[in-house]
Structure formats: C-alpha cells, structure tokens
C-alpha cells in the first residue's frame, strides 16, 4: 500500500486553490473594502466592490486589496484556513501590522512546517520553543534573520525570548561569538548584552554600528570599554582616521570624552568639518564631538590624604588614576573579599585588575582567586590558564559569580583547569558543576565523558542530559547501567530512563519484559537503530498504556521508521490505525546497500515473490 503523503495546502503558485481561498476570505468578510492601515504600513486598502462576483485568481488581486482584515474575524477560521491565508498574504508580499501578525500567529496552533511560505515577519510572533531540534530551529532562525526584528520593541516578550533561543540554536556557548554567529543572528545581534560586546568586540562592534535603536547602558559601557581598549577591528583611538570615524558612525554617541580626547585632534576637526556639510549625520553624534581636546596632564602621584588604608566605600568616589596611584596592590590582595561588597564601576574594576596583574604576573594565588568575586568576570581565559585551582570551594565561589548566565569562556577555562588538576571528573565536582550548569555534561565530548567514573553517574539528574546527543549517551549509558545494576526493576528504570538514548536493542528487549510502561517522550529519544528490530509485541509491552501515543508520533522518527519495518497485519493488532507497514504478500529483502541509499527497506510485490519461490523450488528439485 502507498504511504500517505501530505497534500500541500495550496497548489503551486497561483493555482485555483488560491482563488477559492480568497473567495472564502471575501465571503467571511476578512478583506474589507473600507478598512485602511495606511498609518501602520504606508499601504492603503483598496475597495473590493465587484470582486466577489467572480471568484478571483490570486494573481489578479493587488496587495492593497488583501490588506485590511480585522483580527476578530480570524477566530472563525480553522487553523488550516489561517495557514492558507498567511501563505496568500506572503505570496502577495502584503505588509501587515504588528497586531495582525500577532493575531495570525496566535491562530497557527501548531508549529508550521512550511516556514518559507509564511510572511517573514509573522515568524517573529511564533514561539521559538516550538522549533526545538537542530534542523527545525536552524530553519526557523535562518528565516528570522531576514525578518524585521524592529517591528517589536526591545522590551516586547516576543522579542526577548528570541535571542536566548537563537543563541542556543546556533550552539553559542558563553559570550564568545564568531563572525558567522553574528551574521546568523541578524537583527537580534543588536540585543546582545554587554558581556558579548566585551568578549566579541572584534566581530560585534561593526554590527552594532548599524543597529537602529540606541544601545542600552550595559551595551554602551561594554562598547566604550572595548573601543578604549584599542583592540580590533578599530585599533587604539590615537590611530583612528576619518574613515574610522565614518565606520563608527552609529557608535559615536557612546564614545565618551576620554576616548575622544585620545583621537588625533586634526582627524576630529576634519571629520567634524565634513560631517557638518553632510545632512545625513544626526545631531547627537556631532554634539558629542565638541572641540575640547586639551589633554589633561598625566596624574601619577597620589594626592595627600588619599592613600587608601583599607578597601572601603570611599574608593567608589576615586577617579581611575587615583585608584591606580593610591591603592596598594598588596592591600588589595589581602582585602579582595571586600571588593565584592563595594559597588565599583566597570572602569574602576579594570584598574583594580591591572594592579593585581602587576603584583602577580605569573598568575594569582588561590587565596586571592577564591575571593575575586565579580572581578572574576573581568578575567580573560589567558589569565585563568595561569591559575592553579585545587579547592572545590574556590570553584564554587567563582561559579556563583557567573550564576544565571550562560557558560562563558572564562568559566569553561576555569572548569577545564580544575578538572585537569584533579585528573578525573569525580562525583563532588560533577555535583557542583551540574548544579550550576545543568547542561554541563552534554558540553563534554564523548572522549572527555569516558573519564567520568560510573560512581559519578549518581549525581546526574534527568535535566542534566536534556541537550546530550546520541554519541554522548552512547558513552554514558553503559556507565549508568553499571552504576545502577544493583537496583530492582522499577527503581532501576526510574534511574536509567534518562540515559536510554544510548541503549542497544537487546537492553530495550529486556526492559519490555519488565512492565516498565515507558512514556512516549523517552521512546522518541531512543536510538532509531535500537528501535527498528523491536517487534510490535515488544513495543507494546515496553510502552504499556502509553502505546496509544504512537498514533500521534507516526510521522516522526523513530516511530515512522519502525512502522515501515513492521507487517501491516501486526500493526493492525494494536488497533491504533497506524499506516505504512509492509502489506501482506510482500517480502522484505534487507539489502543493506539499497537501504543505506534509500533509508527504506526494499519491498518485493507478489509477482517477484512468486518468481523467487519458483526459483527456490526449481533449485530444490534439481
């Protein structure tokens, strides 16, 4: 029997299906002659009088005619009709208002498969969590990149949920971005918090230049610090040229006087002269660059009475040069625990770090490291590689500082140093790491995971394995099996359940004999190659009452592939209406080469089977 294939909702471009869809829209009153959204979109809804007389072909309708629809009337449409409407609007490139887009999105109840056919900006209003899995999310965010993110204000919940989901999808760990990452984020790159700007200035600053809205305080501080630091791509302000100033155009409002004073005076004067002739330059950017360039005399000696005797709140009011001149590095090192309690600015922290670097050029001692507090966030991976961290207390103290954030390159380096120092990932360390970073285990390579002793597996919680791929579970499953081997049936299943994505067929067969009632979510995470050899009876026993859930998953792996391997007769015994099994009278030839190429078994119909039987009979008689 033929497998059912999904019929496209609409025929190929401009087919009668679209005409009848529009006829339906008109008759439902979705496209209304008098409604106009000119204020929102710059388009005007055209009158549709007479259009209803002849069901129109979509190509004969202008975008203006499709423009106005009130949200209230969408609720009367089925999900399928809403999707058809969305596709029609996309094909005619109709610009919709935020409200219309939100309204359509709410009515698309399940994650649409045909993302490419939907209006680009509609995707902004869909929940990114619905596109989990590397392929689905990649397709989703590749489209989002091209959408106009600025339809949504920065504070809008729909916009706020996009960035974390995009970073997770593109596999960004910590705050270090590549050029490709920034490209992949599209307009969402403008929402990246300051720590990304600090870590990835080289690739991110050129992107921030063209962000439409103003940067927030956090981004501004980080951009200012990066530009003042003089790293790539712009180099030290003292070397900037007029073309650098042009390139920095969108970031000029964040520069601040210390940077401006470092730019050669002639360059600023030339740039100001030219930009004053060019009306495209906005006023705020010019007013920042006042002709005020007398460099202050270098101040190096500590003013009398300002020498710091202890690290306390009075230092908040010190200028950077005063901190540099008046705070003794040894005093700082012995009172590091106080720094954490005092609200210094980022710029002041830079000075304090610089003092510690001068005192300990070979790397900080653990007594200082343990009390770094949020100064740890100022450390680079290079700084951390010089450290020798042996105490779990120190590790915990520093992880606490980064709590609630993604794992940064600093944290990754710190953990690496710590684990290498210990020689293996013992239970206490794993306990600590997974408490702070539930996804930590899944960030390790299969090779690194092989050094995890089975005893440590007891520290692993189900959520710690959420992002593990099959290769990682292949390594972890045997360890878990060993760790939990002395538990009885039901207790064993509870513990082993989250590791089963690495289980072989024989273990699944064994579990099917133990009345475990595996839930569908666990079943869907099993290795396809481990599920395929299971019989219908084994799957029924394995799932118990959850077997009914197979129907809802029949188009998804591994259920789809498993169905293809079963005899339709056997599937029918489940009474679930599963379709796509091997019909009666067909012979399955497991031609591994053919299957490797096509991904499906080779089926021979009754004719060839009779031929094969005749040949077998003849050879027997001979």
């Amino acid at each position: 029997m033929a497998l059912p294939t999904a019929r496209p909702l609409l025929g190929s471009c401009g087919t009668p299906a679209l005409g009848s869809l529009l006829f339906l829209l008109f008759s439902l009153g979705w496209v209304q002659p008098s409604r106009t959204l000119a204020g929102e979109t710059g388009q005007e809804a055209a009158p549709l009088d007479g259009v209803l007389a002849n069901p129109p072909n979509i190509s004969s309708l202008s975008p203006r005619q499709l423009l106005g629809f009130p949200c209230a009337e969408v609720s009367g449409l089925s999900t399928e009709r809403v999707r058809e409407l969305a596709v029609a609007l996309a094909q005619k490139n109709v610009k919709l208002s935020t409200e219309q887009l939100r309204c359509l999105a709410h009515r698309l109840s399940e994650p649409p498969e045909d993302l490419d056919a939907l209006p680009l900006d509609l995707l902004l209003f869909l929940n990114p969590d619905a596109f989990s899995g590397p392929q689905a999310c990649t397709r989703f965010f590749s489209r989002i990149t091209k959408a106009n993110v600025d339809l949504l204000p920065r504070g809008a919940p729909e916009r706020q949920r996009l960035l974390p989901a995009a970073l997770a999808c593109w596999g960004v760990r910590g705050s270090l971005l590549s050029e490709a990452d920034v490209r992949a984020l599209g307009g969402l790159a403008c929402d990246l918090p300051g720590r990304f700007v600090a870590e990835s200035a080289e690739v991110l600053l050129p992107r921030l230049v063209s962000c439409p809205g103003p940067l927030d305080q956090d981004q501004q501080e980080a951009a200012r610090a990066a530009l003042q630091g003089g790293g790539p791509p712009y180099g030290p302000p003292s070397t900037w040229s007029v073309s650098t100033m042009d390139a920095l155009r969108g970031l000029l409002p964040v520069l601040g006087q210390p940077i401006i004073r470092s730019i050669p005076q002639g360059i600023v004067a030339a740039w100001r002269q030219r930009s004053s002739r060019d009306p495209s330059w906005r006023q705020p950017e010019r007013t920042i660059l006042r002709p005020r360039f007398r460099r202050e005399v270098e101040k190096t000696a500590c003013p009398s009475g300002k020498k710091a005797r202890e690290i306390d709140e009075s230092l908040i009011f010190y200028k950077k040069w005063e901190l540099e001149a008046c705070v003794d590095a040894a005093l700082l090192a012995t009172q590091m625990d106080r720094v954490n309690a005092i609200p210094f600015t980022y710029e002041q922290l830079d000075v304090l770090k610089h003092k510690l670097d001068e005192l300990y050029p070979q790397g900080y001692p653990e007594s200082v490291i343990q009390h770094l507090g949020y100064l740890f966030l100022k450390m680079s991976p290079e700084d951390i590689r010089k450290w020798n961290v042996t105490s779990l207390e120190t590790l915990k103290a520093l992880l606490e500082v980064n709590k609630g954030h993604e794992m940064s390159p600093q944290v990754a380096t710190l953990i690496d140093r710590f684990v290498k120092g210990r020689g293996q990932l013992d239970k206490d360390t794993l306990d600590t790491l997974t408490a702070f970073y539930p996804g930590y285990l899944c960030s390790l390579s299969p090779e690194e995971l092989s050094s995890v002793p089975p005893s440590s597996i007891w520290a692993v919680r189900p959520q710690d394995l959420d992002t593990c791929d099959p290769r990682q579970l292949d390594v972890l499953y045997p360890k878990a099996r060993l760790a939990f081997q002395n538990m009885n049936g039901s207790e064993y299943f509870v513990k082993i359940q989250s590791f089963l994505g690495g289980a072989p067929t024989e273990d699944l067969k064994a579990l099917s004999q133990q009345n475990v009632s595996m839930d569908l979510a666990t079943f869907m995470k099993l290795r396809t190659d481990a599920v395929l050899p299971l019989t219908v009876a084994e799957v029924q026993k394995l799932l118990g009452p959850h077997v009914e859930g197979l129907k809802a998953e029949e188009r998804h792996r591994p259920v789809r592939d498993w169905i293809l391997r079963q005899r339709q007769d056997d599937l029918d015994t489940l009474g679930l209406g599963l379709q796509g099994g091997i019909p009666n009278g067909y012979l399955v030839l497991d031609l591994s080469m053919q299957e490797a190429l096509s991904g499906t078994p080779c089926l021979l119909g009754p004719g060839p089977v009779l031929t094969v039987l005749a040949l077998l009979l003849a050879s027997t008689l001979a």
Epitope: E221, A341, F344, T345, Y346, L349, Y374
Partner: nanobody, 119 residues
Framework: QVQLVESGGGTVQAGGSLKLACAAS????????MGWFRQAPGKEREGVAI????????YYRDSVKGRATISQDNAKKSVSLQMNSLRPEDTAIYYC????????????WGQGTQVTVSS
C-alpha cells in the same frame, strides 16, 4: 523591566540649592544600594553619593561632603539627593543608579537629569 526615572534637574545660580529625585520601578526585592553618579562634559563619570537601603549607611565624594545629603523612601523605592551651596563645577548630568548585593558593577541606570550651575 527595571526603570529608574530622575527628576528635579535644571539651571540654578551658584550658591543655590536643588533636590534631585529618583523613582524606581521593577527593582528586584534584593537590591541593596542606590546612589547618584554624574558626568560633566569632557570628564570621567564619577560617584557623588550612595546609600545602603538596608542599613541607611551613606557615603559621599569629598568635594560634596557637607553640601549634599542622600536619603531614601523605602516604601516608595525612591532616593533623593539634596544639593546645597551649588558650584559651577557641579554642572553635569546626574544619574540615579541601583545594584543588588555582591552583583558586580551598578546594574541599573536612569537616563539622567541635567544640572547646570551658572556663576
């Protein structure tokens, strides 16, 4: 969404007084320090005064000691800065700031209010 909104800025004669107010909304319950920073044209941003909201302890920069008073109204999650005997060098944009305990640099900043002292 945390918002700090400053008010009370303006132009005043040297020797005059001004009271800046900062209304906070959306601050986490755990925040424990509020304060005022300022930035004059062409100068580094600098702290003016801070107050620990839990203990009421206050700290001032040397140049405003005796002339400035920072105070809080816990019920309204607001903080004010009374500035007396104003000098031309007090001319700056004044920013309200807030922070949670041990959380790193000032996390929350207002948009700023301009104070101009004319001689």
């Amino acid at each position: 969404q945390v918002q700090l909104v400053e008010s009370g800025g303006g132009t005043v004669q040297a020797g005059g007084s001004l009271k800046l107010a900062c209304a906070a909304s959306g601050l986490p319950r755990t925040y424990n320090v509020m304060g005022w920073f300022r930035q004059a044209p062409g100068k580094e941003r600098e702290g003016v005064a801070i107050i620990y909201t839990t203990t009421g302890a206050t700290y001032y920069r040397d140049s405003v000691k005796g002339r400035a008073t920072i105070s809080q109204d816990n019920a309204k999650k607001s903080v004010s800065l009374q500035m007396n005997s104003l000098r031309p060098e007090d001319t700056a944009i004044y920013y309200c700031v807030a922070r949670q305990p041990n959380s790193g640099p000032w996390e929350y900043w207002g948009q700023g209010t301009q104070v101009t002292v004319s001689s």
